[in-house]
């Protein structure tokens, strides 16, 4: 018999453990400021209600939509008005407007301190005393910091987190075991968050078509033995899954993702030869494994692309007959043949091909007009190839920190209006592309670098949208998803920028700098570099090198001094004076 109750349906499909985890994530992503204990109470109430509906679907309110049930529950939070201000106004609205309102109030930069692993003994005691609460707290802390985190993937990372503590809390040296493992997991979580934020932005700002095109290219590279119909099916399912998660429909999203994994594993033969190992795993690991699976080998008998897309006399007829299918087929065929290209580049090529057909199919002699279309791809391919070559050479010469600083200078000159914390965060992440991609073989560099840059630049776009200060950023972020990176790359220094007034307070440092972890020390130095550039945007590389060298020496000297605070107070103003003289 058909299920009347949506919440009972999801509770039964997902099981209690996953249901509770997903509800906790959903509430934490919407009400990011609420304490953990408040969320636990809401989750408990929601789960009890769902359990009741699973037992009797005709129960009161069991037939209500999930948005109605979730929204009603969120709106019972007592401190909503004081803690969230405008968010409380959402509760005056009816569904679906109420949920849309909640979504617009998600804060991409809530300003919580970074998640760190404190004393291992304390952590292990907490883990062993109450495992459920410990893991729930982890889910909550990640979800509130990353309001668009891909919820089913967060359940997977929580399982990994549990595994780390299960293993390391038995170890003789808990810290030695925990530190590298939690750090590696933290990195994965941050990358995962940024990737999903990019997917959500693609869907929300550029629509289904943009997301589907991105997915066609990616999946065609991964599964070159699958035919276009198979790729289309996977893309349609994947779009539904991510639309649901990005829209806060986490139960539906996780359920559909599980269905998709089931479909892939039941149809391995027509998708890829690399899936068997993944498909033998339990659900969470299976879905994660499928998402990360290595790409299949290319079929040996691929015909030249030109036959169907240039030389065929019926190109225009085929294009006009079913434009999106024809362009989709082009993107699929091109992508499966070019695993070494970035998805962004493949989409630019498809865009160029589409523009050429639009123009040529309206002429008297289309074949002679579009006959050289593949030649027009050359500069589009060479641009990211050169960019990767030049920047990897720079990275190899300077190392990660030096490369970050070079990018910091580059981007501060391009976008001096952008806030210092944003410039530092984004440039540090852009600089990591070196470590992440430049060490890879030539054939993997471009796809690694450019697709990673797309994700990082999306972070800039998302942060800038919250408080827009630069028309240049707005333009690059909103004009074209696939051309964002080339748009930012093409920017020269901003000649309209009026330098910032000098403020000695910005360059005043204290002894607390000495006790900071290395990464945070770097952030402080890099923030000073940005402020310096905002004050003197015309500073040369040599001048900056001198000033930053002096600054490093000053920090080292004072941190080694007996009276650190005294040293900072005495030497700081001298450093500022010397820097001003050097940049005069």
């Amino acid at each position: 018999e058909a299920q009347q109750s949506e919440i009972a349906h999801r509770y039964n499909d997902l099981g209690e453990e996953h249901f509770k985890g997903l509800v906790l994530v959903a509430f934490s992503q919407y009400l990011q400021q609420c304490p953990f204990e408040d969320h636990v109470k809401l989750v408990k109430e929601m789960t009890e209600f769902a359990k009741g509906c699973a037992a009797d679907q005709s129960g009161a309110d069991c037939g209500k939509s999930l948005h109605t049930l979730f929204g009603d529950k969120l709106c019972t939070v007592a401190s909503l008005r004081e803690k969230y201000g405008e968010l409380a106004d959402c509760c005056e609205k009816q569904e679906p407007e109420r949920n849309e309102c909640f979504l617009t109030h998600k804060d991409d930069n809530p300003g919580f301190p970074p998640l760190v692993t404190p004393d291992p003994e304390v952590m292990c005691t907490a883990f062993q005393e109450n495992e459920q609460q410990f893991l729930g707290k982890y889910l909550y802390e990640v979800a509130r910091r990353h309001p668009y985190f891909y919820a089913p993937e967060l359940l997977y990372y929580t399982q990994q987190y549990k595994g780390v503590f299960t293993e390391c809390c038995q170890a003789a040296d808990k810290a030695a075991c925990l530190t590298p493992k939690t750090e590696a997991l933290r990195e994965k979580v941050l990358v995962s968050s940024a990737r999903e934020r990019f997917k959500c932005a693609s869907l929300q700002k550029f629509g289904d078509r943009a997301f589907k095109a991105w997915s066609v290219a990616r999946l065609s590279q991964k599964f070159p033995k699958a035919d276009f119909a198979e790729v289309s099916k996977l893309v349609t399912d994947l779009t539904k899954v991510h639309k649901e998660c990005c829209h806060g429909d986490l139960l539906e999203c996780a359920d559909d993702r599980a269905d998709m994994a089931k479909y892939i594993c039941e149809n391995q033969d027509s998708i890829s030869t690399k899936l068997k190992e993944c498909c033998d795993k339990p659900l969470l690991e299976k879905s994660q494994c499928l998402a990360e699976v290595e790409r299949d080998e290319l079929p040996g008998d691929l015909t030249p692309l030109a036959a169907d897309f240039v030389e065929d006399k019926e190109v225009c007829k085929n294009y006009q007959e079913a434009k999106d299918v024809f362009l989709g087929t082009f993107l699929y065929e091109y992508s499966r043949r070019h695993p070494e290209y970035s998805v962004s580049l493949l989409l630019r090529l498809a865009k160029e091909y589409e523009a050429t057909l639009e123009k040529c199919c309206a002429t008297a002699d289309p074949p002679s007009c579009y006959g050289k279309v593949f030649d027009e791809f050359k500069p589009l391919v060479e641009e990211p190839q050169n960019l990767v070559k030049v920047n990897c050479e720079l990275f190899e010469k300077l190392g990660e920190y030096g490369f970050q600083n070079a990018l910091l200078v580059r981007y501060t000159k391009k976008l001096p209006q952008v806030s210092t914390p944003t410039l530092v965060e984004v440039s540090r992440k852009l600089g990591k592309v070196g470590t992440k991609c430049c060490t890879k073989p030539e054939t993997e560099r471009m796809s690694c670098a450019e697709d990673y840059l797309a994700v990082v630049l999306n972070r800039l776009c998302v942060l800038h949208e919250k408080t827009p200060v630069s028309d240049r950023v707005t333009k690059c972020c909103s004009e074209s998803l696939v051309n964002r990176r080339p748009c930012f790359s093409a920017l020269a220094g901003d000649e309209t920028y009026v330098p910032k007034e000098f403020n000695a307070e910005t360059f005043t440092f204290h002894a607390d700098l000495c006790t900071l972890p290395d990464a945070e020390k770097q952030v402080k130095k890099q923030s000073a570099l940005v402020e310096l550039l905002k004050h003197k945007p015309k500073a040369t590389e040599e001048q900056l090198k001198t000033v930053m060298g002096d600054f490093g020496a000053f920090v080292d000297k004072c941190c080694a001094a007996e009276n650190k605070e005294g040293c900072f107070a005495e030497e700081g103003p001298k450093l500022v004076a010397a820097a001003q003289a050097a940049l005069a």
Epitope: A229, S232, K233, L234, N267, S270, D301, E321, A322, V325
Partner: nanobody
Framework: EVQLLESGGGLVQPGGSLRLSCTAS????????MGWVRQAPGKGLEWVSW????????YYADSVKGRFTISRDNSKNTLYLQMNSLRAEDTAVYYC???????????WGQGTLVTVSS
């Protein structure tokens, strides 16, 4: 416009053979997955078999595996279904279908009736 024209159906005794053909027009045949769908009297539609655009991979419903063979000739825009060892339960209207996405079809023909009876 898209047209799919089936032929080759008829009355055949159990254990006998038939070869169905489907001629396609109005679309780029070699770009699409094609298949055969059937509807037995009083039943719903079921996928019998499908074949990739390049012919390199085929799928068969469990009920016809080892008895039916799907093939295509892209130069002739034609799809075939060779049916051997026919059984009474294979009696149905067989439709040629164009598939733009796995598991679905957007066009199918008028159908050709296959009756297996002694």
């Amino acid at each position: 416009e898209v047209q799919l024209l089936e032929s080759g159906g008829g009355l055949v005794q159990p254990g006998g053979s038939l070869r169905l053909s489907c001629t396609a027009s109005g679309f780029t045949f070699r770009h699409y997955r094609m298949g055969w769908v059937r509807q037995a009297p009083g039943k719903g539609l079921e996928w019998v078999s499908w074949i990739r655009p390049d012919g390199t991979f085929t799928y068969y419903a469990d009920s016809v595996k080892g008895r039916f063979t799907i093939s295509r000739d892209n130069s002739k825009n034609t799809l075939y279904l060779q049916m051997n060892s026919l059984r009474a339960e294979d009696t149905a209207v067989y439709y040629c279908a164009k598939s733009y996405m796995a598991g679905t079809f957007d066009y199918w023909g008028q159908g050709t009736l296959v009756t297996v009876s002694s």
